[in-house]
């Protein structure tokens, strides 16, 4: 789960071990130099592409060993209470709309994965974050416009869904409804945040599956 310090560290890919080794080598050679992440990644990726299967073997062995470690630790890992119990989600409820950044990510994820095969989900996300930060306001606009449109649609759909789901609501007093409106909005905000976290988790899971295919 998120933030559980006892949860085993995720397994590392062969490429991740290679990058880690590159970083350590670079630190030894240039202890005081600050690393330009995108330049460094580019160089690592280029080196990885030219490496022979024999050279990659060492890192693949490290990845296998780490996978075994992860699986071993996961067998004995007990998640904190309540984590396995997800609150009921109506599959018919309108799906929360993606943010502008989320739309941007789905557009540029193939680029990152293509250029840096084997990059961990965290590093892919980090790179996408960097890319988003380097995208000028003018180029962010189409994603923001699309996200706003989808949000608008979602708000209409969710209102219709809630109205449909609560036929008694109309019979109850207007005053009582007004009082509870603020509380309800706060709850909805919390729900939205949870939804967003869950969607991110789902996307991470999907990515892990994608990585397995490659």
């Amino acid at each position: 789960g998120k933030g559980d310090p006892k949860k085993p560290r995720g397994k590392m890919s062969s490429y991740a071990f290679f990058v880690q080794t590159c970083r350590e080598e670079h630190k030894k050679k240039h202890p005081d130099a600050s690393v330009n992440f995108s330049e460094f990644s580019k160089k690592c990726s280029e080196r990885w592409k030219t490496m022979s299967a024999k050279e990659k073997g060492k890192f693949e062995d490290m990845a296998k060993a780490d996978k075994a470690r992860y699986e071993r630790e996961m067998k004995t890992y007990i998640p904190p209470k309540g984590e396995t119990k997800k609150k009921f989600k109506d599959p018919n409820a309108p799906k929360r709309p993606p943010s502008a950044f989320f739309l941007f990510c789905s557009e540029y994820r193939p680029k990152i994965k293509g250029e840096h095969p084997g990059l961990s989900i965290g590093d892919v996300a980090k790179k996408l974050g960097e890319m988003w930060n380097n995208t000028a306001a003018d180029d962010k606009q189409p994603y923001e416009k699309k996200a706003a449109k989808l949000k608008e649609k979602y708000e209409k759909d969710i209102a219709a869904y809630r109205a449909k789901g609560k036929p008694d609501a109309a019979k109850k007093g207007v005053v009582k409804a007004e009082k509870s409106k603020k509380k309800k909005e706060e709850e909805e905000d919390e729900e939205d945040e949870e939804d967003e976290e869950e969607e991110e988790d789902e996307e991470d899971e999907e990515e892990e599956e994608d990585d397995d295919d490659e």
């Epitope: 193939p110 994965k113 988003w132």
Partner: antibody, heavy 120, light 113 residues
Framework: EVQLLESGGGLVQPGGSLRLSCAAS????????MVWVRQAPGKGLEWVSR????????GYADSVKGRFTISRDNSKNTLYLQMNSLRAEDTAVYYC?????????????WGQGTMVTVSS | DIQMTQSPDSLAVSLGERATINCKSS????????????LAWYQQKPGQPPKLLIY???TRESGVPDRFSGSGSGTDFTLTISSLQAEDVAVYYC?????????FGQGTKVEIK
């Protein structure tokens, strides 16, 4: 090797149409913004059009708006420029280029160009 | 649209001497949220496509000799060739990628004196 190769240029009469293609290789084509830039004989560079990685977003220079259509086929790693209602002032070498979108937005890879001549 | 204006239009410099090209944008291409200038420089030799030299106004593209350097911020930029070589004879263009449409300067022709 990262490469872009344009084709489809030629001589066409005013009012005619032409479809340019740009075949990409050596990189993840589906992850890049792609652009067309043209250069009239003896003149400077003029940005013509761009398309987002998925093909969902496009942009055009005012001089070609409504006449040119940019598109892409990610399964074929190919970029296209459909040029209709061609005018004499569209005569130029047409380059396709890769825009390093999201990383820095400059055009880091260029094709060799294809010549389009509009003349009667 | 952002207009890009280069000066001079042409420049003749002796081999080994410094060549300086200026580029001015009609509005700032500095994005305040990341403090980066969305400006690139290209080199175009006769009969060839342009080649990216500099991006972010001052970052050299990999493989570009270090005699090429870019500087400036906001609306005023400079491309400097510290010691002109015979192979540097070309037309140089600045370009903004801050907004769409992307726009180029008219070009500066660099020749040997």
């Amino acid at each position: 090797e990262v490469q872009l190769l344009e084709s489809g240029g030629g001589l066409v009469q005013p009012g005619g149409s032409l479809r340019l293609s740009c075949a990409a290789s050596g990189f993840t084509f589906s992850g890049y913004m792609m652009v067309w830039v043209r250069q009239a004989p003896g003149k400077g560079l003029e940005w013509v059009s761009r398309i987002s990685p998925s093909g969902g977003q496009t942009g055009y220079a005012d001089s070609v708006k409504g006449r040119f259509t940019i598109s892409r086929d990610n399964s074929k790693n190919t970029l296209y420029l459909q040029m209709n209602s061609l005018r004499a002032e569209d005569t130029a070498v047409y380059y396709c280029a890769r825009e390093e979108g999201g990383s820095y937005g400059a055009f880091d890879i260029w094709g060799q160009g294809t010549m389009v001549t509009v003349s009667s | 649209d952002i207009q890009m204006t280069q000066s001079p239009d042409s420049l003749a410099v002796s081999l080994g001497e410094r060549a300086t090209i200026n580029c001015k944008s009609s509005q700032s291409v500095l994005y305040s949220s990341n403090n980066k200038n969305y400006l690139a420089w290209y080199q175009q030799k006769p009969g060839q496509p342009p080649k990216l030299l500099i991006y972010w106004a001052s970052t050299r593209e990999s493989g570009v000799p270090d005699r090429f350097s870019g500087s400036g911020s906001g609306t005023d930029f400079t491309l400097t060739i510290s010691s002109l070589q015979a192979e540097d004879v070309a037309v140089y263009y600045c370009q903004q990628y801050y907004s769409t449409p992307r726009t180029f300067g008219q070009g500066t022709k660099v020749e040997i004196k």
